[in-house]
Amino acid sequence: EEELQVIQPDKSVLVAAGETATLRCTATSLIPVGPIQWFRGAGPGRELIYNQKEGHFPRVTTVSDLTKRNNMDFPIRIGNITPADAGTYYCVKFRKGSPDDVEFKSGAGTELSVRAKPSAPVVSGPAARATPQHTVSFTCESHGFSPRDITLKWFKNGNELSDFQTNVDPVGESVSYSIHSTAKVVLTREDVHSQVICEVAHVTLQGDPLRGTANLSETIRVPPTLEVTQQPVRAENQVNVTCQVRKFYPQRLQLTWLENGNVSRTETASTVTENKDGTYNWMSWLLVNVSAHRDDVKLTCQVEHDGQPAVSKSHDLKVSAHPKEQGSNTAAENTGSNERNIY
């Protein structure tokens, strides 16, 4: 009679993570008598997956009745497959021996490949806010996918970005892989409503890529522009001066009025108006009693935005020496304004 051969008809099997893998094996003869064992890998480090004779293998179920005396089919099913199960599986026939069974013949092996989906991409931006015209970096990470081939793209408001660098780790063979990408984005004043998107495409996703997003509102700081204007005299001896704080983001802002360098009033932006681009406007006004001033008054609107160094704009009020009985002892003149940093 021809010597027993162990046939593993499938050279390779591809299974999605979480599914069940079926590994087939057939012996061509009933002789010699002895059990079948399944191993993953070869050599001294091979791992016992199933022993027909003894042992407890909770993830493995047998497809046919292996206890039947004339059975020559020895397929197994391995449940809840993970990327860690990838490898070559060998069906091995043992010859009954005393005291121990002896390995008799091995099948050629079946390579089990596991397809695992990448995790949802996580996009993270810089730790500190940056102002328009600055370049900031965003990172995107996704883990646990297999096979290694993967495509990653970056978008800003639907427009594909080209300035990015991507790595897939590890470089060598592994049960699963991770991708890490860093993109550079130049901020503009209109980016409060902008979004950066990282898109990952993988064979397991059936053409429906995974996306991770970051809102630039978390990253951008748009510094305000200031304008100080003098309103017409509201009443005798009183001048209304306004400070227009425009196009700032985020909302956190504190304004201080100074009269000749002395703090007059400090307030926090509360009732702001929002612009279409997501930035804010705010106005503060100061009623100046010019009769209380002998000389010209320098009014300064000083703004501290989002914890940054203060910016300011000044306005000079000229106090004229008119006789009081004429009912107008003040002349207000806008002699220009300047913007400067106060540290």
């Epitope: 191993f39 070869a42 050599g43 001294p44 480090g45 091979r46 791992e47 016992l48 021996g97 005291p99 121990d100 002896v102 390995e103 091995s106």
Partner: antibody, heavy 122, light 107 residues
Framework: EVQFQQSGTVLARPGTSVKMSCKAS????????MHWVKQGPGQGLQWIGA????????TYNQKFKGKAELTVVTSTSTAYMEVSSLTNEDSAVYYC???????????????WGQGTLVTVSA | DIQMTQSPSSLSASLGERVSLTCRAS??????LNWLQQEPDGTIKRLIY???SLDSGVPKRFSGSRSGSDYSLTISGLESEDFVDYYC?????????FGGGTKLEIN
């Protein structure tokens, strides 16, 4: 009781070969991989390779491929290692040890031979 | 190849003292690590297998543990016969590799 009896000390000339033995007793020889380990004078341990007596399947550390050749005679439960093209670098104590026919934690390198000292000298 | 970095390479200690030897694996080896003891005459004996399982006949003062990629052998209460050489060995992946060894000397 499991025991490995290794052959005695060898003094060899550079360029020649030596063949040492490791006789196993006390268990089924064919259920285990036989491994060989090198220890140079005052140095650490280096795994050379292993052989499976059932089918003479061998696996080597790349560093020792072409330098060491592993064989077995199952009828006498003896493993052999031949080291060829000897140089001073091959002067060492060579140990045999074993692991189970699959990766069973409890069976890795439990039992060791007493070692064979090889001295290469002109 | 997986590198096993063993530290310290030598250690002086006193009788009754508690000492720890460490091996760091360059790649993941799970729990597949042995600790071996080598006598001055060359005799090798396994003390610990699978990171923390004590071999039969090995005194309970020997114990093994793991923290991430660091594997430790602790001897609590050194006795005179413990002042010998110790090696770790990974058997997770071929080629199987040993740590450089630790020589434990009496103070």
């Amino acid at each position: 009781e499991v025991q490995f009896q290794q052959s005695g000390t060898v003094l060899a000339r550079p360029g020649t070969s030596v063949k040492m033995s490791c006789k196993a007793s006390g268990s089924t020889f064919t259920s285990y991989w036989m491994h060989w380990v090198k220890q140079g004078p005052g140095q650490g341990l280096q795994w050379i390779g292993a052989i499976y007596p059932v089918n003479n399947d061998t696996t080597y550390n790349q560093k020792f491929k072409g330098k060491a050749e592993l064989t077995v005679v199952t009828s006498t439960s003896t493993a052999y290692m031949e080291v060829s093209s000897l140089t001073n670098e091959d002067s060492a104590v060579y140990y045999c040890t074993r692991s189970f026919y699959y990766s069973l934690d409890a069976a890795w390198f439990v039992y060791w031979g007493q070692g064979t000292l090889v001295t290469v000298s002109a | 190849d997986i590198q096993m970095t063993q530290s310290p390479s030598s250690l002086s200690a006193s009788l009754g003292e508690r000492v720890s030897l460490t091996c760091r694996a360059s790649q993941d080896i799970g729990s597949r690590l042995n600790w071996l003891q080598q006598e001055p005459d060359g005799t090798i004996k396994r003390l610990i297998y699978a990171t923390s399982s004590l071999d039969s006949g090995v005194p309970k003062r020997f114990s093994g543990s793991r923290s991430g990629s660091d594997y430790s052998l602790t001897i609590s209460g050194l006795e005179s016969e413990d002042f010998v050489d110790y090696y770790c060995l990974q058997y997770a992946s071929s080629p199987f590799t040993f740590g450089g060894g630790t020589k434990l000397e009496i103070n």
